[in-house]
Interface confidence: low
C-alpha cells in the first residue's frame, strides 16, 4: 500500500488530525520536500542578521549580515564583525596586525609576510599591515651595485617571542 502522505507536495504537510489530507503549511512555516508530516518554522533574520530571501511555503528564509559584518558558518549561521584592512578580529575586537604580518581583507586573520629569501629572491617592495611584500629577482640577478631592501623580520608566531 502506498503511503497517502507521499502525495503531499512541497509547501504542504500530511495532516494526521485531518485523515492524512494534504494541508498547506501555516504562515511562517515551509516544507521543501513532498511527503512531510510537519512544516518547519521559517528562520527569522533578526538583529545583526538581515533577510536576503523571504521564506516561502516551499523554502526557508535566507539571511545575510548587516553592513559592518560578514557571514560565517553554513547558511550564514553567524555574523562576524568586519575589521579594516591591516587588522584582525580578536575576542577583544579589531586589532592591528603585528609587525611582519598583513591582512588585505576586512575579515580573516593576519598572515605572515612572504619570506622572499626562501625562494632565493629579494624584497622588491616592503610589506605593510595591509599588503604582503613583493618579491623581486634573486640577488644574483640584480646588476652590480644594485641594493636590495632588507627582508622583513619573521612574523610573530605561537612559540616565538619578539624580544
Amino acid at each position: 500500500l502506498q503511503d497517502p502522505c507521499s502525495n503531499c507536495p512541497a509547501g504542504t504537510f500530511c495532516d494526521n488530525n485531518r485523515n492524512q489530507i494534504c494541508s498547506p503549511c501555516p504562515p511562517n512555516s515551509f516544507s521543501s520536500a513532498g511527503g512531510q508530516r510537519t512544516c518547519d518554522i521559517c528562520r527569522q533574520c533578526k538583529g545583526v542578521f538581515r533577510t536576503r530571501k523571504e521564506c516561502s511555503s516551499t523554502s526557508n528564509a535566507e539571511c545575510d549580515c548587516t553592513p559592518g559584518f560578514h557571514c560565517l558558518g553554513a547558511g550564514c549561521s553567524m555574523c562576524e564583525q568586519d575589521c579594516k584592512q591591516g587588522q584582525e578580529l580578536t575576542k577583544k575586537g579589531c586589532k592591528d596586525c603585528c609587525f611582519g604580518t598583513f591582512n588585505d581583507q576586512k575579515r580573516g586573520i593576519c598572515r605572515p609576510w612572504t619570506n622572499c629569501s626562501l625562494d632565493g629572491k629579494s624584497v622588491l617592495v616592503n610589506g605593510t599591515k595591509e599588503r604582503d611584500v613583493v618579491c623581486g629577482p634573486s640577488p644574483a640577478d640584480l646588476s652590480p651595485g644594485a641594493s636590495s631592501v632588507t627582508p622583513p623580520a619573521p612574523a610573530r608566531e605561537p612559540g616565538h617571542s619578539p624580544q
Epitope: K91, K92, I109, P158, S161
Partner: antibody
C-alpha cells in the same frame, strides 16, 4: 627563553583574600595580552580572566566577576590576580599564560595552588 | 557561551596506533580561533595546534588538526610513548574563552 613564574598561592579560609603574581621574562611583556587559567583538582581547564597590553581592558569569567581583579605592572613585567571573597570552588591550580588572542595561549607558567578551606 | 564537547572521554590505544580526537562546538566557530593543548600529569598545558590546523613551534608533524564550523579533529598519526596525556580544545572566538572537558589518551 620565555618564562612565566607564578607565586602567591596557599591555603586560605572561605571569604578570605589572596593575591597571585606572575613574573614574566624572555619576551616583551608590554606587547602581549595575558590571561589567568585555572584547573580544579582532577578537573579540566577554566579560563578566569585576561588583560590587554596596556592594562586598560579586562575581562572575567562569570564565576569570578566582581570578586577577582586582574592587573599588570609593565615596568616590573608582572601580572597579578587579586582574589577576594574566596569560595571552596575557587580551589585550583592557577596558571598565568601569554595570550596570543586568536592563536590561543602559547606559554604557560608552572601554576600555583590555591586551596580555600576552613 | 560556546560549549566545546570533546569525545571520547578516554581513548585506550597502543603506541604506533592512530588517535582521532573530536571537539564539537555548540555554535559555529571560525577555524582561526580553535586551538588544541596537551597536558601531562603535574605539568602545565602545552599549545599543539592553533587556527584549527597550524602546528605550534616545535610540535612534531605526527600531530595534525582539521575541521571547521562546529566540528574539529585532532589526529595523532602514530602514537609515541610521550603522547599519552590529556588533550583539550579551546576557542578564543568569543567571551568567555572556553575549553573542552578533555580527552584522555591512555596506554591500552
Amino acid at each position: 627563553e620565555v618564562q612565566l613564574l607564578e607565586s602567591g598561592g596557599g591555603l586560605v579560609q572561605p571569604g578570605g583574600s589572596l593575591r597571585l603574581s606572575c613574573a614574566a621574562s624572555g619576551f616583551t611583556f608590554s606587547s602581549y595580552d595575558m590571561s589567568w587559567v585555572r584547573q580544579a583538582p582532577g578537573k579540566g581547564l577554566e579560563w578566569v580572566s585576561d588583560i590587554d597590553p596596556t592594562g586598560s581592558k579586562t575581562d572575567y569569567a562569570d564565576s569570578v566577576k566582581g570578586r577577582f581583579t586582574i592587573s599588570r605592572d609593565n615596568s616590573k613585567n608582572t601580572l597579578y590576580l587579586q582574589m577576594n571573597s574566596l569560595r571552596a570552588e575557587d580551589t585550583a591550580v592557577y596558571y598565568c599564560a601569554r595570550d596570543l588572542m586568536v592563536y590561543g595561549f602559547d606559554y604557560w607558567g608552572q601554576g600555583t595552588l590555591v586551596t580555600v578551606s576552613s | 557561551e560556546i560549549v566545546l564537547t570533546q569525545s571520547p572521554g578516554t581513548l585506550s590505544l597502543s603506541p604506533g596506533e592512530r588517535a582521532t580526537l573530536s571537539c564539537r562546538a555548540s555554535q559555529s566557530v571560525s577555524s582561526s580561533y580553535l586551538a588544541w593543548y596537551q597536558q601531562k600529569p603535574g605539568q602545565a598545558p602545552r599549545l599543539l595546534i592553533y587556527g584549527a590546523s597550524s602546528r605550534a613551534t616545535g610540535i612534531p608533524d605526527r600531530f595534525s588538526g582539521s575541521g571547521s564550523g562546529t566540528d574539529f579533529t585532532l589526529t595523532i598519526s602514530r602514537l609515541e610513548p610521550e603522547d599519552f596525556a590529556v588533550y583539550y580544545c579551546q576557542q578564543s572566538y568569543s567571551y568567555p574563552v572556553t575549553f573542552g572537558q578533555g580527552t584522555k589518551v591512555e596506554i591500552k
